[in-house]
């Protein structure tokens, strides 16, 4: 089947959510692990990731259409320590499939704001760290 992975971000007050979304068929879920890495250009794996999610087949979903599964990593308050390069990945050892999303970056600025760049859905997100608004 056709499986792909996308990255996105959302802001809720001072919190920043980094979201990895895997699009797949229902029957393809089992055996996949989705994971988010930081500053791991060559060895992004579940063991080295910030967070991982093992997908389960949801018996409550009917049909064989494409569905999505999401891993969400929440940063409660962005600090300079969160600056870096991030990547959403997924793999199934059973099927022999590995997906690697585009790299995106968080840059904490001197003014106390931060920007998220490199996301495909929203090419450039800039957040105000203090006020918690999208600018």
């Amino acid at each position: 089947g056709c499986i792909n992975i996308t990255s996105s971000a959302s802001q809720e007050g001072t919190r920043l959510n980094l979201i990895c979304t895997v699009w797949h068929k229902k029957e393809e879920a089992e055996g996949f692990v989705v994971f988010l890495c930081k500053d791991r250009s060559g060895d992004c794996s579940p063991e080295t990731s910030l967070k991982q999610l093992r997908l389960k087949r949801d018996p409550g979903i009917d049909g064989v259409g494409e569905i999505s599964s999401q891993l969400m990593f929440t940063i409660s308050q962005v600090t300079p320590l969160h600056s870096g390069t991030y990547q959403c990945c997924a793999r199934s050892q059973k099927s022999g499939i590995r997906l690697q999303g585009h790299f995106f970056s968080i840059l904490f600025t001197e003014t106390g704001n931060y920007t998220v760049t490199g996301l495909k859905q929203r090419q450039h997100l800039e957040f105000s760290h203090n006020e918690g608004t999208l600018s």
């Epitope: 692990v33 063991e47 059973k94 099927s95 022999g96 499939i97 590995r98």
Partner: antibody, heavy 112, light 107 residues
Framework: QVNLQESGPGLVRPSETLSLTCTVS????????VNWFRQPPGKGLEWMGT???????DYNSALKSRLSISRDTSKSQVFLKMNSLQTEDTAIYFC??????WGQGVMVTVSS | DIQMTQSPASLSASLGETVSIECLTS??????SAWYQQKSGKSPQLLIY???RLQDGVPSRFSGSGSGTRYSLKISGMQPEDEADYFC?????????FGSGTKLEIK
């Protein structure tokens, strides 16, 4: 129908390099990765390494210094090269698409 | 490396009998376990993945269970064609590792 077929020399001299080919059909190497496993006669299985659908590789750390896995997607072939062979490398070598589909294996004997 | 301690090493069972094989792992593998059947002179066949999921085409008399560091394979009603070697495997961490195998024979 998914099919994998290993091929290579049945006999290799100690200290020489082993070259094996896994020819696949029924799927694309751009969509699915291939593992190499081996099994000494009468023994258990050992994972050697993986070449993923995106071309990236992962190796067993115990073999990494002398193992290389590559592919030719246009020919639907995956290659294993392992140097400095010793008698303890005598085994049946299998390629597999993920864990689901395995070749029948090729017996490799390391002997002088 | 994660060690996979498989038991028993060999097992004899009568036709129709229910048999179980166990694998203990040296650390929690979060259900990233699989079971294979290997008949004499053949390549391994995947039976169970993700600890308990039955691979397509595998008879329902095979089942897998477990979590953490303890996993098991159960055959409910031994059949003649089940005479084979069985291996557990973990795919939680590299290198992927296998148990030493269980030889299942008909009594």
């Amino acid at each position: 129908q998914v099919n994998l077929q290993e091929s290579g020399p049945g006999l290799v001299r100690p200290s020489e390099t082993l070259s094996l080919t896994c020819t696949v059909s029924g799927f694309s190497l751009i969509s699915y990765g291939v593992n190499w496993f081996r099994q000494p006669p009468g023994k258990g299985l050992e994972w050697m390494g993986t070449i993923w659908n995106d071309g990236g590789t992962d190796y067993n750390s115990a073999l990494k210094s002398r193992l290389s896995i590559s592919r030719d997607t246009s020919k639907s072939q995956v290659f294993l090269k392992m140097n400095s062979l010793q008698t303890e490398d005598t085994a049946i070598y299998f390629c597999a698409r993920g864990f689901e589909h395995w070749g029948q294996g090729v017996m490799v004997t390391v002997s002088s | 490396d994660i060690q996979m301690t498989q038991s028993p090493a060999s097992l004899s069972a009568s036709l129709g009998e229910t048999v179980s094989i166990e694998c203990l792992t040296s650390e929690d593998i979060s259900n990233d376990s699989a079971w294979y059947q290997q008949k004499s002179g053949k390549s391994p066949q995947l039976l169970i993945y993700a600890a308990s999921r039955l691979q397509d085409g595998v008879p329902s008399r095979f089942s897998g269970s477990g979590s953490g560091t303890r996993y098991s394979l159960k055959i409910s009603g031994m059949q003649p064609e089940d005479e084979a070697d069985y291996f557990c495997q973990q795919s939680y961490k590299y290198p992927l590792t296998f148990g030493s195998g269980t030889k299942l024979e008909i009594k």
